[in-house]
Interface confidence: low
């Protein structure tokens, strides 16, 4: 009796660039690393049948179910998905085994269910079952991390309630600025939710999940560092968490550092001090100022003091909704085709926003970074020099912005022509837009200089291809005109290109197109 | 300051294991990765693979598995690497090295270096 | 695995020149790459990280460049204390690989 042939059941999820239906493929598209289902064989069932491990997939996400089967010989197949029979094509790979494919490109619905994968080898005949669904990524949440003070210990719980659970991290630097960025050597991650070692310079908890990553910074205030020349300002929501950190170093103990809110002292049980000695054996005091729930009357200045340092304050502010200051009117630009440029927008946010940029219906990543006025920039340099509008979109969870730009490049006209029989038209797409002569040619002016002003008609910006304005002019045909060449001419400040067209009876025309500088 | 100070040389017979440690002090033991990477004589540089004393999670290079493990011990903050299955091209120098950040990065501190000699 | 080749293996040069050495990683490695000196019986130093980041307390005259996977390690001035074999080392993905390693001798 022979052995059962081996079979490997493996899922390849592919990156998105294509749309079409489910189909049976022997040569799946280049793609991630294959993940092993296991392909067990189901207890209790009549025949060779081998269960997959079910496959949940996002919407849109294009995938490959794979079959390879290390059995002798030839192999035949057939795929049934909800009744109906789909083409299947089976190959050898490298290592001599067959290969049997199943290519869903752009999950939707009705692709979720199950698929039977019938396979005949010279020894035997064998089923395989994929149970394919949709994950259900609209329960999905990810939160914004927030702190906790730790019951009776001097440490912080970070926490983000998010679905599914997230996986929460301390990130930790000790250094200043940009040594700070995530991939130096400065930075320490621990993956862990409650955070002792509460000194260094800059502390942030980040979630992460299936939907990304949310972190927040521990507002802190040194009293070592020079302060700001604009007052630091935090925004909370009404309800969430207010966490602010004092710190502050100094050559001996013989120092203390105070809270106090609009010029009064806060209430016990409003903060909580640590203190440690450092490595050149100067100490480290900190202080933190908390209220676990804000309310619109904990707005203010809030002041650290200490006996040994100039006293340095940050304006918290309670809103009850969350806000995305910026100016939305439109702004156009004009530059050279080699001139570096690009659009910036500035805002202030509370909660974080997230953003994109968009061009030609495409989206491209959007960065941002913080100002030292309590701003932030987004700026969006990837134009490739590319006329026409440009969109930035900002959301959070309470307000939604959007600001249209007009990107123009300065460049000499190109022309296109077309004809019929009763007119021509002639098209350019330069910047500044152009202005239009049309001249016929003849025998009196064979240089082509008799200019025509009857019968034209000029229209400018009549046509906009994602924001880019299209002149054109034409030119109505009369007798006077029929059978001879005519000459349409776009100028503007940076040069002149023009197209000769022989207006003769209706049919293909030839275009002879000059370009003048 | 940071410090890595490794146990001292071994002569082994092919075959045999060796175990290697690595005391760390100076710094949090639980935030740093600790890698580690071997240079047999007159050759480059050879990464085996890391710990993250955290967890104790560990992560080999292809070539290493089966026979490397590495351990840790957070009371003492020192984590052990054990090679078994020793041939004499296992004669080398292995560093211990520490890595800031839980995704890898640049190697900032360095153990002195552990000689271990296979040899009949 | 990614592989990273180093170039020249080695290289005689005279103090004060500027020496360049060159790291080609064989996939794109982002800015996730170290620079490493390494002299004879001591275990190597961390020059530069993220690729063109100077580790504290390293000479300026020491820069790294690149990204993707064509990076630069470049030494200004050549001085005596330079003369070691260096190292590049990707980040990117595990198995954390080095390069061969290049050698700088004196002319």
């Known amino acids: 009796n022979q052995d059962l042939p081996v079979i490997k059941c493996v899922l390849i999820n592919h990156k998105n660039n294509d749309s079409s239906v489910g189909k049976s493929s022997s040569y799946p598209m280049v793609s991630e690393s294959p993940e092993d289902l296991g392909c067990a064989l189901r207890p209790q069932s009549s025949g060779t049948v081998y269960e997959a491990a079910a496959v949940e997939v996002d919407v849109s996400a294009s995938i490959t179910l794979q079959v390879l089967v290390d059995a002798p010989g030839n192999i035949s197949c057939l795929w049934v998905f909800k009744h109906s029979s789909l083409n299947c094509q089976p190959h050898f790979d490298l290592q001599n085994r067959g290969v049997v494919s199943m290519v869903i490109l752009k999950m939707t619905e009705t692709q979720a269910g199950e698929y039977l994968l019938f396979i005949q080898s010279e020894a035997t005949n064998y089923t395989i079952l994929f149970t394919v669904s949709i994950r259900n990524t609209l329960l999905y949440t990810l939160r914004r991390p927030y702190f906790r003070k730790m019951e009776n210990q001097d440490a912080l719980v970070c926490i983000s309630e998010s679905v599914p659970e997230p996986i929460v991290e301390w990130v930790l630097c000790d250094s200043q600025g940009e040594s700070c960025k995530e991939e130096s050597p400065a930075v320490v991650k621990k993956e862990e939710k409650v955070l002792h070692e509460l000194f260094g310079t800059d502390i942030r908890c980040c979630a992460r999940n299936e939907l990304g990553r949310e972190c927040t910074r521990l507002f802190t205030i040194d009293l070592n560092q020079t302060p700001q020349t604009t007052l630091p300002q935090l925004f909370l929501k009404v309800g969430e968490p207010l966490w602010i950190r004092c710190k502050a170093v100094h050559v001996n103990h013989g120092f203390g550092l105070t809270w106090e809110l609009e010029n009064k002292a806060l209430e016990e049980g409003n903060y909580f001090e640590m203190s440690t000695y450092s490595t050149n054996r100067t100490m480290i005091r900190i202080l933190f100022a908390f209220v676990s729930s804000v309310a619109r009357n904990d707005t203010g200045y809030y002041t650290c003091s200490s006996s040994k340092h100039p006293s340095q304050s940050a304006l918290v502010t309670i809103v009850e909704k969350g806000f995305i200051n910026a100016t939305n009117s439109s702004e156009d630009y004009e530059i050279d085709q080699y001139e570096e440029f690009c659009f910036s927008v500035r805002f202030k946010a509370y909660p974080q926003i997230r953003c994109t940029w968009t061009f030609s219906r495409k989206s491209f990543p959007c960065e941002q970074k913080g100002l030292d006025n309590g701003y932030s920039i987004s700026k969006f340099c990837n134009h490739k020099h590319q006329p026409g509008e440009y969109i930035f979109h900002a959301e959070n969870d309470d307000a939604q912005f959007t600001k249209m730009f007009t990107l123009n490049i300065r460049r000499k006209p190109q022309v296109l022509a077309e004809a019929s029989a009763s007119q021509a038209s002639c098209f350019s797409d330069g910047y500044p837009l152009p202005s239009w002569t049309w001249k016929k040619c003849s025998d009196k002016s064979p240089n082509c200089t008799e200019e025509i002003t009857e019968g034209v008609w000029n229209r400018k910006a009549n046509r906009k291809v994602f924001g880019q304005w299209v002149s054109s002019s034409t030119l109505n045909m009369s007798e006077a005109i029929k059978g001879f060449l005519v000459k349409c001419c776009a100028y503007n400040s940076l040069g002149t290109s023009c197209e000769t067209i022989l207006l003769n009876s209706p049919g293909p025309f030839p275009f002879i197109q000059d370009n003048i500088s | 300051q940071v410090q890595l100070v490794q146990s001292g040389a071994e002569v082994k017979k092919p075959g045999a294991s060796v175990k290697v440690s690595c005391k760390a002090s100076?710094?949090?033991?639980?935030?740093?990765?600790m890698h580690w990477v071997r240079q047999a004589p007159g050759q480059g540089l050879e990464w085996m693979g890391r710990?993250?004393?955290?967890?104790?999670?560990?992560s080999y290079a292809q070539s290493f598995q089966g026979r490397v493990t590495m351990t840790r011990d957070t009371s003492t903050s020192t984590v052990y690497m054990e090679l078994s299955s020793l041939r004499s091209e296992d004669t080398a120098v292995y560093y211990c090295?520490?890595?800031?950040?839980?995704?890898?990065?640049?190697?900032?501190?360095w153990g002195q270096g552990t000689l271990v000699t296979v040899s009949s | 695995d990614i592989q990273m080749t180093q170039s020249p293996s080695s290289l005689s040069a005279s103090v004060g020149d500027r020496v360049t050495i060159t790291c080609r990683a064989s996939?794109?490695?982002?800015?996730?790459l170290g620079w490493y000196q390494q002299k004879p019986g001591k275990a190597p130093k961390l020059l530069i990280y993220?690729?063109?980041s100077l580790q504290s307390g390293v000479p300026s005259r020491f820069s790294g460049s690149g990204s993707g996977t064509d990076f630069t390690l470049t030494i200004s001035s050549l001085q005596p204390e330079d003369f070691a074999t260096y190292y590049c080392?990707?980040?990117?993905?595990?198995?954390?690989?080095f390069g061969q390693g290049t050698k700088v001798e004196i002319k």
């Open positions: 710990i993250n004393p955290s967890g104790g999670s560990t």
């Open positions: 080392q990707q980040s990117y993905s595990s198995p954390f690989t």
């Open positions: 996939q794109d490695i982002r800015n996730d």
């Open positions: 100076g710094y949090t033991f639980t935030s740093y990765y």
């Open positions: 090295a520490r890595v800031p950040g839980l995704y890898g990065g640049a190697i900032d501190y």
């Open positions: 993220a690729a063109s």
